[in-house]
Structures are given as C-alpha cells and as structure tokens.
Interface confidence: low
Amino acid sequence: QLTTESMPFNVAEGKEVLLLVHNLPQQLFGYSWYKGERVDGNRQIVGYAIGTQQATPGPANSGRETIYPNASLLIQNVTQNDTGFYTLQVIKSDLVNEEATGQFHVYPELPKPSISSNNSNPVEDKDAVAFTCEPETQDTTYLWWINNQSLPVSPRLQLSNGNRTLTLLSVTRNDTGPYECEIQNPVSANRSDPVTLNVTYGPDTPTISPSDTYYRPGANLSLSCYAASNPPAQYSWLINGTFQQSTQELFIPNITVNNSGSYTCHANNSVTGCNRTTVKTIIVTELSPVVAKPQIKASKTTVTGDKDSVNLTCSTNDTGISIRWFFKNQSLPSSERMKLSQGNTTLSINPVKREDAGTYWCEVFNPISKNQSDPIMLNVNYNALPQENGLSPG
C-alpha cells in the first residue's frame, strides 16, 4: 500500500521537510502532489511525468518545493502556513490511481521568554502575585521553575491561562524565588531570565542582645536590637518609656545604678506599617543578688554498674540563672553516657559505670552571683561476673 512519511514530522520554522514515499508502484505514468487531504487541481503543488522526467509546478507551488524521481517531495524554508496535510496521487499504467496522504507540523523557533508580574513587591501573608510568561504563542507548552526546581504541589500555587500564568497565593518571605518560565514546542525550548520577588514582611518581634540583665557600675552598656524585616526595620530606643534615640544600637558608657530600668527597642517597617517592641530589664548593682542554695536529688544513690541508669536533679527557685554540674571537681558531662536536659537541671548517666561512683554537686549562677548545692554521693555496685551461655569461665 502506498504511504507517505514526513521527515521530520515536527519541523522548525525556516528548516526543511521531506515527504518520503513508500511502496511506490512499479508501472507508473506519473504523479502529483497536492496541498490538503484530497486531490484538488487548484491546490496542486507539482506534477511529474516519468516518461519525460519533467516536473511541472502547479497553482500551489511556492518555488520552495523539489520533487524527486522516487516521488518524494522536499519543501525548504518552511513557514507555519505550510503546516497541514499533503496528498500524493500516482497514476499507474493500468490507469488506476492510488493516493496517500501525509502531514507535518511547523513550529516556530521560540524566542527567549520573559516574565511579567502584577506585583513585584508583595506584602507577606496578604498579597497574591500573578506571574505571566510572555509572549503568548500557539502550540506552546509553558513550564515554571522555582529555585531551579519544577513547581511543587501546593494549594498556594495556581496555574491558569494554559499554564502561562502562575499565581502565588498569600506570599511568604520564603517565596522570593528565583522564578523562571520555560516555553516549549516540539522543535525548540527557551527559558526566561530569573525573576525574584521582593517580599515585604515584618518586622518580627525584635531581639535585644546581649541577653545579660545584671551589670556593674562603671561598665559600658551596649545593646543591639534586630528584627527580621523587609525593608529593614527602623529602630528606636526608649528607657523607662522615654525616647532616647533612633538607632539600632544603644551605647551608654560608664553606667551607674541610675541607668537601671526598662529598655525598650521599637522596630518599625514603614512599608507594611507594622511595629513590634521588645522590653529588656537592665539592673546595675554593686551588690550580688543572693542566689539561693540549690537542692540536689538522685533517682537512686546506690546503683548496679553497667546495668542501671541514674538521674540527678538540681532544683532552685531562682530565675534568670544557669546551672552547671561537677563531679570530683570536674565539670560535666565528661562522657557520652552523661546527658544534660531541661535547661541543665537534670543530669542523666546511662549506663552507670564503676568510674561514675563518687561525689556530685551542682552550681547555680548568674552574672553576679553563684551558689553550690550540698554534695551527693553515688555508690556503684557490681554483681558477680556474668557468665556466657551458662558456662563457667574457663
């Protein structure tokens, strides 16, 4: 059976396509090519007479077509208008005509796309952003990339307009991108330059550092305030409710007890219109605030070595303190079997070994004062040597 095959089937605009013919009958007078799915004289491209080896152009000939003795048709410099069906009619010597129809599709070489956005400075948790991939072209697949990865499945990401528009619902500060769109057709692909979002957010609750509360008279007080914000926050300081200065850092040299009080950092984002404050108490004192003696307790004071575990707990009613542990005048933990938890209030030893026997105590401290617990004695016993497989050691 007479057939035709397009090589290639998908053709890039400006390239060439060859309409190959298979199973061409032996005894022929000639053949003709037509544009379309049927034989139509008004749409004949070319006719070829075998006897004279003469090609004759038809009404639909554009000057870009070449017919070969094997009936194949070459079309050069194709345009999108060339897309469609082509019909070959062969006139056999028995005067029985045979026809075969083939087709090909011409696609444009795609340009480099670009991304347009309805809002390049969205506000976090408030705005939606619609990205559109330009230009709009027919028979084109639109793909999107975020951080060089394909789109994750998320209810906040919505594709529309044939995937040409990507809508990001309720943006967050993590949605900065970069975003890229890629356009594809069967013959070409091109990716846009990356676009980033400038997500306006914050300020978050500011943090004042350092965390110290107690200071000695004569020291320098240097406080720094930071709040995550875009654009960066504007900062101001208040002491005991009275405005001091509009800076991110506050420096007071040679402080006295009169500098004790409430230090407030105020962070403002002029774009979002949001404000956040943090208050820190500063105490300037010669005296060491008395830290009460902590209490130490053990889950058990006599344990079996290599078998039992023990928890030591250091209890204090003071606030704003830190806790450290000591064993035989060495700070803990000293081995992987020792773990501190719950803000260092609990020391866990698992399992207990012979070398863990001895005196333990804890110490609570703040920048100004400290106090130690009474010591507690941990005794470690060992049972008779374990026997393997019920056999006496030999």
Partner: antibody
Framework: EVQLLESGGGLVQPGGSLRLSCAAS????????MSWVRQAPGKGLEWVSV????????YYADSVKGRLTISRDNSKNTLYLQMNSLRAEDTAVYYC??????????????WGQGTLVTVSS | QSVLTQPPSASGTPGQRVTISCSGS????????VSWYQQLPGTAPKLLIY???KRPSGVPDRFSGSKSGTSASLAISGLRSEDEADYYC???????????FGGGTKLTVLG
C-alpha cells in the same frame, strides 16, 4: 475560647438570594483562612469555598461557582457567604470553619454550629 | 459521588479496634495532607486528625491516622459507645483547586 457563630439562614424561594454571616471570636480572625462547608439533610459534608486570611485568595467548589460569593471583613471579625440564584440542591446546613494552617496543609480545626438554608417554593 | 472514597459503614464492639479507609488519587491524598473529622449526631463536625497523623489537643490517643500513597486510614482502638458517629476524611485537591471530603462512614458500636 474559639467561637464561630453562623447566622442568616432561612427559607428562600428558588432563584432567590441570601447572605450568611459567621461571627468569629476568641482568636485573631485576620490570621486564619476561613471556609464554608455545607451538609444537605442526611448527606455528607461538601466544601463550598475558602478565603485566605487576607482575602487575596479565593476558591470555590464547581457546584457553586458564579452563584455564591465568599468575603470577609477582618475589622468586624466576620465571614460572609452571598448566595444568589439559589437552587433546591443548595438546601443544607452551612457551617463556617477555620483553617489553622493558612492553607499550607488545609484542615478545619473549629466549626460553627451551622445555619440551615432551605430553598423551596 | 465523592472524590474521596470511604466505606459507608463500619462497626465494632466496645474495646475493639476499628479502621476506616479513605481512598483518593495523586491530585489529593497522594500529594496533600489528609484530615479526619468526627460528627456526632446533631452536632457540627470535630477535627480528629490533621496532617495525615497528627492529633489536636484534647483528642484521645485512641484515635490515630496514617497514609500510604493515595490512601489514608483512621484507626480507633479501645472502641467506646460514645465513638458512634459519622467519620469523614478530607484533603486539598489540586485538580479541583478545592477541598474534598469523603462520603462519610457511619460507625456503629455494637452491644
């Protein structure tokens, strides 16, 4: 205590309109996405619509698109559902529900007691 | 016809363990979190499980959720008479751009 209180339900003729309200209290309303979910008598739950906490994102079930409109007034801590061109199949108890995840992992942790909408001639 | 498929009914005796299934597709359960809701007769639904397996505070640990592929399950152990209710699964569906529920499972506590 989180409370969601729907109102505005009642009997309405086919083709008619109704506006449901959901008054929220006990939480910062503007921080939460809100949904309407309905339940026809003796039937299961059917999600109707969701609105993001800022109101910038809205989705509808296909069965109500073009007829029902969700909105919110964060200054009044109130969620609304404007119902137009009502049909008999819109007869249901309408619940408002809160999504605590801002749509990142949609779920409904608090529900109102519901308000009954009956569409009948 | 619900997008998520649940058995219409389930039953068990007090103390038993009962499992309710919920089947979906990659556009919902397969790529999104599943929630489970309990609706006692004449009341509004109550959240039992969210994010596939997490329990809100106040929900007994007798209730547990799990997910594998495009299916999810709710398990109730130590069944009690007060567990008699309708149970619904739900998830976001990216192809519908909306939330979808299962048709609901009526749980009966026998005896």
């Amino acid at each position: 205590e989180v409370q969601l209180l729907e109102s505005g339900g009642g009997l309405v003729q086919p083709g008619g309109s109704l506006r449901l309200s959901c008054a929220a209290s006990g939480f910062t309303f503007s921080n939460y996405a809100m949904s309407w979910v309905r339940q026809a008598p003796g039937k299961g739950l059917e999600w109707v619509s969701v609105i993001s906490h800022g109101g910038g994102s809205i989705y509808y079930a296909d069965s109500v698109k073009g007829r029902l409109t969700i909105s919110r007034d964060n200054s009044k801590n109130t969620l609304y559902l404007q119902m137009n061109s009502l049909r008999a199949e819109d007869t249901a108890v309408y619940y408002c529900a809160r999504d605590p995840t801002k749509g990142y992992a949609p779920t409904f942790d608090y529900w109102g007691q519901g308000t009954l909408v009956t569409v009948s001639s | 016809q619900s997008v998520l498929t649940q058995p219409p009914s389930a039953s068990g005796t007090p103390g038993q363990r009962v499992t309710i299934s919920c089947s979906g597709s990659s556009s919902n359960i397969g790529n999104n979190y599943v929630s489970w809701y309990q609706q006692l007769p004449g009341t509004a639904p109550k959240l039992l499980i969210y994010a596939d397996s997490k329990r809100p505070s106040g929900v007994p640990d007798r209730f547990s959720g799990s997910k594998s592929g495009t299916s999810a399950s709710l398990a109730i152990s130590g069944l009690r008479s007060e567990d008699e209710a309708d149970y619904y699964c739900g998830a976001w569906d990216v192809s519908h751009n909306g939330y979808v529920f299962g048709g609901g499972t009526k749980l009966t506590v026998l005896g």
